[in-house]
């Protein structure tokens, strides 16, 4: 990019430039006529018999250098050929001078700084590469010549610029005084400034863009070269906010249109909003769920959102004594999460009809909550009591919902207790072919005791056939008709209303050898 | 703004011939074409020939050829124009013009005269 | 030498009227021709040179074209000041030469 400082193409007005010394044959303002047709102001000079040593002076007016620290210097001038002109002198040139003078203000005057080099800087000796010789018509009159000269390091606030001639026939049809700048440059969502270069190579620190965040690793910057362009090299820079794709060759952010979303910042587009999902504004890092739907903490923000699931389906029970079994079928919606548990709360009601929540007594295995199977097994039921259990099936946006969960629930009523089991047998008497026996009556919880069974076998003679039963309704029993000298096995059970209770501990019980030894008390 | 001065009317015999001169005024003359038109009472215009001083030879028309020498004095920034074998019916005025621009500060040299001398009046008359 | 031809060698007008004035030169001159204007014992005034350029100074109702062989002069809207001779000139030889003049008289 280049900026001007000086361009007399452009002026229209007379440009009043300083020349010295105040001769004839000096340089002369004129009106000129370039190559489009325009009218332009040039400075002619044409004093081909001079004598040698004579210079003429040319210099523009001041020029503020706006920070560049190196001048371009565009001349366009025509020259004469010295062997066209007849009455040339040797002293007759085909080249001319420029020199720059450098000040902090408007300072020079007619004769200061003195007309020399030092203190005027030489820049270069320029020639003519066309030179102008006497054309038939209205031909071209010759070639334009086009130099472009560097000036400079500069340090002070302008400057000035000359030309000196010593002998040429030439115009200086226009000058153009420029510096060459970095233009502002947007690449990889980062902008770096328009920048003038004031070395050979400036590093220049980028910024993000709109909506852009800088990306990690060192902060983005590029490298402005003396000749106004940006030196190639990749940028690590920023990229769109969570919210923004990047849009127009990656040199702008644009917000996501409504729909759609971007969760992180980076690479990569807006999507449409995941399943059950909506953004209504433009720029949505994140689209909000719809009413009932949720997204759980550790979700990403790009997931669907999901709702609870409905209640567990079909429980069946299946009541043990004081077990019960619990099983049931997922239920029809997951919510559209897999991480589906169950958990169950309980209520117990008494015979007497009051009711609470269920006892610490009560186990559920593998537990209460947080199940993944669709089953439990709940032991310590209390006889007699109505068990509710309700089911529920929970996702992790269960916690999120509000309002009631929904659940199956089953009723479960426990038998009234049975009486204990009879345990404390004794024989009261022994003889080789019958065994009497008596126990202590057990509390039964739900009535009196109605009658016993007990239940007897050879020891040794452990098949179903071989096992006796004789029920007494007192609390003692004679075992008749068993082998002499036989070693056996006994266990007695109580009914009550509520039916019968577990069988006792086996007693080890054996008969006499012999009739002589008579009937024995034998205690156990 | 430069100004072309003429000598004075001139009248002549016939078979002379006489020389006009044209006195440029201030600033450069050198590089400018100076053309010389004439004019008979009534008549159009009559292009003769033209200069450009620094390169000395001048360019005519092939009607005057030989009779015509169109010089140019640049220590005076002075041109002349000398007629010669005059007759009867090179009565007439004659200018002096000057180019609008340059050799050197225009790319075409379309010799536009856009400076003209007052005019001088020659006269042939046995 | 190249020959220049005016047409209309005269013309009546009124103020305000648009005038075209016409040249044909006997080759092609590209487009090297000059439009002068000549008041009656003045010298002439250059109007337009490379066929289409406005002289500095020279009103803009005054235009040129043409390229090659035919070439235009126009006022848009003819003034009292206009009322006198025009000329072509061609300098795309070594010989100049001028047309044979168009006289502009009111009508």
């Known amino acids: 990019l280049e900026e001007t400082l000086l361009n007399t193409k452009l002026e229209t007005a007379d440009l009043k430039w300083v020349t010295f010394p105040q001769v004839d044959g000096q340089w002369e303002e004129l009106s000129g006529l370039d190559e489009e047709q325009h009218s332009v102001r040039t400075y002619e000079v044409c004093d081909v018999q001079r004598a040698p040593g004579q210079a003429h002076w040319l210099r523009t007016g001041w020029v503020p250098r706006r920070g560049a620290v190196h001048v371009y210097a565009t001349l366009r001038f025509t020259m004469l050929e010295c062997l066209s002109l007849p009455r040339a002198g040797r002293s007759c040139k085909e080249t001319f001078t420029v020199f720059y003078y450098e000040s902090d203000a408007d300072t020079a005057t007619a004769l200061t700084p003195a007309w020399m080099e030092n203190p005027y800087i030489k820049v270069d000796t320029v020639a003519a590469e066309h030179l102008t010789r006497k054309r038939p018509g209205a031909e071209a009159t010759g070639k334009v010549n086009v130099k472009t000269l560097r000036l400079g390091p500069l340090s002070k606030a302008g400057f000035y610029l000359a030309f000196q001639d010593q002998g040429a026939c030439m115009a200086l049809l226009s000058l153009h005084l420029f510096y060459k700048k970095c233009a502002q440059l947007t690449v990889n969502l980062t902008r770096f400034p328009e920048t003038v270069p004031r070395e050979l190579v400036v590093p220049v620190a980028g910024s993000c863009v709109v909506d852009a965040v800088p990306a990690p690793g060192p902060s983005p910057s590029l490298y402005c070269r003396e000749d106004g362009q940006w030196a190639e090299q990749p940028v690590t820079g920023c990229s769109c906010a969570p919210g923004f794709e990047a849009a127009e060759g990656n040199t702008k952010c644009r917000a996501c249109a409504q729909g759609t979303f971007k969760p992180l910042s980076g690479e990569g587009s807006c999507q449409p909003c995941p399943a059950n999902s909506h953004s209504n504004t433009i720029g949505s890092a994140v689209c909000q769920c719809r009413v009932g739907y949720f997204r759980a903490r550790t979700d990403p923000r790009g997931a669907p959102c999901t709702t609870p699931p409905s209640a567990p389906r079909s429980v069946v029970s299946r009541l043990n004594g004081s077990s019960l079994h619990l099983e049931w079928s997922a239920p029809l919606e997951s919510g559209g999460r897999e991480d589906l548990t169950y958990a169950l709360r309980c209520r117990e009601c008494r015979p007497g009809g009051s009711c609470a929540p269920c006892g610490g007594d009560l186990t559920f295995d593998p537990g209460p909550r947080d199940l993944v199977e669709p089953w439990v097994v709940v032991r310590g039921l209390r006889p007699d009591f109505t068990y509710t259990f309700e089911v529920t099936a929970l996702n992790g946006v269960s916690s999120l919902a509000t309002g009631p969960v929904p659940f199956e629930p089953v009723n479960v009523t426990t038998d009234r207790e049975v009486p204990p089991a009879v345990s404390d047998i004794r024989v009261t008497r022994s003889s080789p072919s019958s065994l009497s026996l008596a126990w202590a009556v057990p509390r039964a919880p739900s009535g009196a005791v109605l009658d016993y069974e007990v239940k007897y076998h050879e020891k040794g003679a452990e098949g179903p056939s071989s096992v006796r039963f004789l029920k007494t309704s007192e609390n003692r029993a004679e075992l008749r008709g068993l082998k002499r000298g036989a070693s056996y096995l006994v266990q007695v059970r109580a009914r009550s209303e509520a039916g019968y209770g577990p069988f006792g501990q086996e007693h080890h019980s054996q008969t006499q050898l012999d009739e002589s030894e008579g009937w024995r008390e034998q205690l156990a | 703004q430069v100004q072309l001065v003429q000598s004075g009317a001139e009248v002549k015999k016939p078979g002379s011939s006489v020389k006009v001169s044209c006195k440029a005024s201030?600033?450069?003359?050198?590089?400018?074409?100076i053309s010389w038109v004439r004019q008979a009472p009534g008549q159009g215009l009559e292009w003769m020939g033209s200069?450009?001083?620094?390169?000395?030879?001048?360019d005519y028309a092939q009607k005057f050829q030989g009779r015509v020498t169109i010089t140019a004095d640049e220590s005076t920034s002075t041109a002349y124009m000398e007629l010669s074998s005059l007759r009867s019916e090179d009565t007439a005025v004659y200018y002096c013009?000057?180019?609008?621009?340059?050799?050197?500060?225009?790319?075409?040299?379309?010799?536009?005269?856009?400076?003209w001398g007052q005019g001088t009046l020659v006269t042939v008359s046995s | 030498d190249i020959q220049m031809t005016q047409s209309p060698s005269s013309l009546s007008a009124s103020v305000g009227d648009r005038v075209t004035i016409t040249c044909r030169a006997s080759?092609?001159?590209?487009?090297?021709l000059n439009w002068y204007q000549q008041k009656p014992g003045k010298a002439p005034k250059l109007l337009i040179y490379?066929?289409?350029i406005l002289q500095s100074g020279v009103p803009s109702r005054f235009s040129g074209s043409g390229s090659g062989t035919d070439f235009t002069l126009t006022i848009s809207s003819l003034q009292p000041e206009d009322f006198a001779v025009y000329y072509c000139?061609?300098?795309?030889?070594?010989?100049?030469?001028f047309g044979q003049g168009t006289k502009v008289e009111i009508k």
């Open positions: 013009a000057r180019s609008s621009y340059t050799i050197l500060t225009t790319y075409y040299n379309y010799n536009a005269m856009d400076n």
């Open positions: 201030g600033g450069t003359f050198s590089t400018y074409a």
């Open positions: 200069i450009i001083p620094i390169f000395g030879d001048a």
């Open positions: 080759q092609n001159i590209n487009n090297f």
């Open positions: 490379g066929s289409s």
């Open positions: 000139h061609q300098v795309s030889d070594t010989s100049d030469t």
